[in-house]
């Protein structure tokens, strides 16, 4: 389809991307799937400016982003290179902590109450943010 010129209803435009902020919680895999159903992806943070934008909209609430290490190395869901890209981890994070008693470590990244990142158990029901790039989106709005 042709490129989208503006964001769908209830999405927020910022720097040629559209963002949707959930108000309920889901496990990381469900949040990831929701964004894909909407022809989007969990938010990929590529700069301090984008970090501040997202942080402003989510407030001091644990919120999933599109970063995980479920298959070994840390990966962004859209293929953005993790090693050379922007990072904003809390001190001592990620730590793949096993002491939570839920089985396994911590493989999914989220914004914490101060905006910095932490790795946590992917099954926790956190809010999430979807992102889609205007230049990549099709003309039709996502299914609602």
């Amino acid at each position: 389809g042709s490129e989208r010129t503006c964001c769908p209803v209830n999405w927020v435009e910022h720097e040629r991307s559209c963002y949707w902020f959930s108000r309920s919680g889901k496990a990381w895999a469900d949040a990831d799937n929701y964004c894909r159903l909407e022809d989007a992806h969990l938010v990929v943070v590529t700069s301090w400016e984008e970090q501040k934008f997202v942080q402003h909209h989510i407030g001091p609430v644990n919120t999933w982003m599109g970063l995980h290490d479920q298959n070994g190395p840390w990966k962004w869901v859209d293929g953005t290179d993790y090693e050379t890209g922007f990072k904003n981890w809390r001190p001592e994070q990620p730590d793949d902590w096993y002491g939570h008693g839920l089985g396994g470590g911590e493989d999914c990244a989220h914004f914490t109450d101060d905006g910095r990142w932490n790795d946590d158990v992917c099954q926790r029901p956190y809010r999430w943010v979807c992102e889609t790039e205007l230049d990549k989106a099709s003309q039709e709005p996502p299914l609602l």
Epitope: L37, E140, L144
Partner: antibody
Framework: QVQLVQSGAEVKKPGASVKVSCKAS????????MHWVRQAPGQGLEWMGW????????NCAQKFQGRVTMTRDTSSSTAYMELSRLTSDDTAVYYC???????????????WGQGTLVTVSS | DIQMTQSPSSLAASVGDRVTITCRAS??????LAWFQQKPGKAPKSLIY???SLQSGVPSRFSGSGSGTDFTLTISSLQPEDFATYYC?????????FGGGTKVEIK
């Protein structure tokens, strides 16, 4: 009436790939999600993934990531599922099933294809 | 992943019997549950969605109930064409998962 008609049975060697088709009729193909489900001989049902025909967007179960490719041709209202690096464990009947039209009903199936038997044997 | 556990795995019943099949989810799925019927060599047929809503064309002797983690499929008066395997499926969480099936056989 809604119909999902699948391609015929296939016999493949281990390591090969198979591509199964599912031709939809009787409804607007781009208005509903399409799913793929498989069933090994004498076993239960196993969900593989979905495709959104309108955009071509997909998602699949982690078990199949990197091995399954779901595509569609809107001009012929046909969905395709390709599974690569086949092993004997992939011997199964593969079904397409129509999902819902929205992000809240995406996982609700109403119509199923007749199934395609894929046999993997050396 | 959410595990779906069906019981019994098989049962024998007679025409006219009331048959009840249960399905338990490993976590709360609200009413995001469907039931399917499958006969040997055939594709599954959708019976019930949203735990209790009948798919179009499904006889009213089939009914579903439950919410949260515990669900039931009831056939009020078993007919000869109802001898089949029945599956539940949760459609709440990714990935979608099915129960192991319940085979309803002739007594």
């Amino acid at each position: 009436q809604v119909q999902l008609v699948q391609s015929g049975a296939e016999v493949k060697k281990p390591g090969a790939s198979v591509k199964v088709s599912c031709k939809a009729s009787g409804y607007t193909f781009t208005g509903y999600f399409m799913h793929w489900v498989r069933q090994a001989p004498g076993q239960g049902l196993e969900w593989m993934g979905w495709i959104k025909p309108k955009s071509g967007g997909t998602n699949c179960a982690q078990k199949f990531q990197g091995r399954v490719t779901m595509t569609r041709d809107t001009s012929s209202s046909t969905a395709y599922m390709e599974l690569s690096r086949l092993t004997s464990d992939d011997t199964a009947v593969y079904y397409c099933a129509r999902g819902g039209a929205t992000v809240t009903t995406w996982g609700v199936f109403d119509y199923w294809g007749q199934g395609t038997l894929v046999t993997v044997s050396s | 992943d959410i595990q779906m556990t069906q019981s019994p795995s098989s049962l024998a019943a007679s025409v006219g019997d009331r048959v009840t099949i249960t399905c338990r989810a490993s976590q709360d799925i609200s009413n995001y549950l469907a039931w399917f019927q499958q006969k040997p060599g055939k594709a599954p047929k959708s019976l019930i969605y949203a735990a209790s809503s009948l798919q179009s064309g499904v006889p009213s002797r089939f009914s579903g109930s439950g919410s949260g983690t515990d669900f039931t499929l009831t056939i009020s008066s078993l007919q000869p064409e109802d001898f089949a395997t029945y599956y539940c499926q949760q459609c709440d969480s990714f990935p979608l998962t099915f129960g192991g099936g319940t085979k309803v056989e002739i007594k």
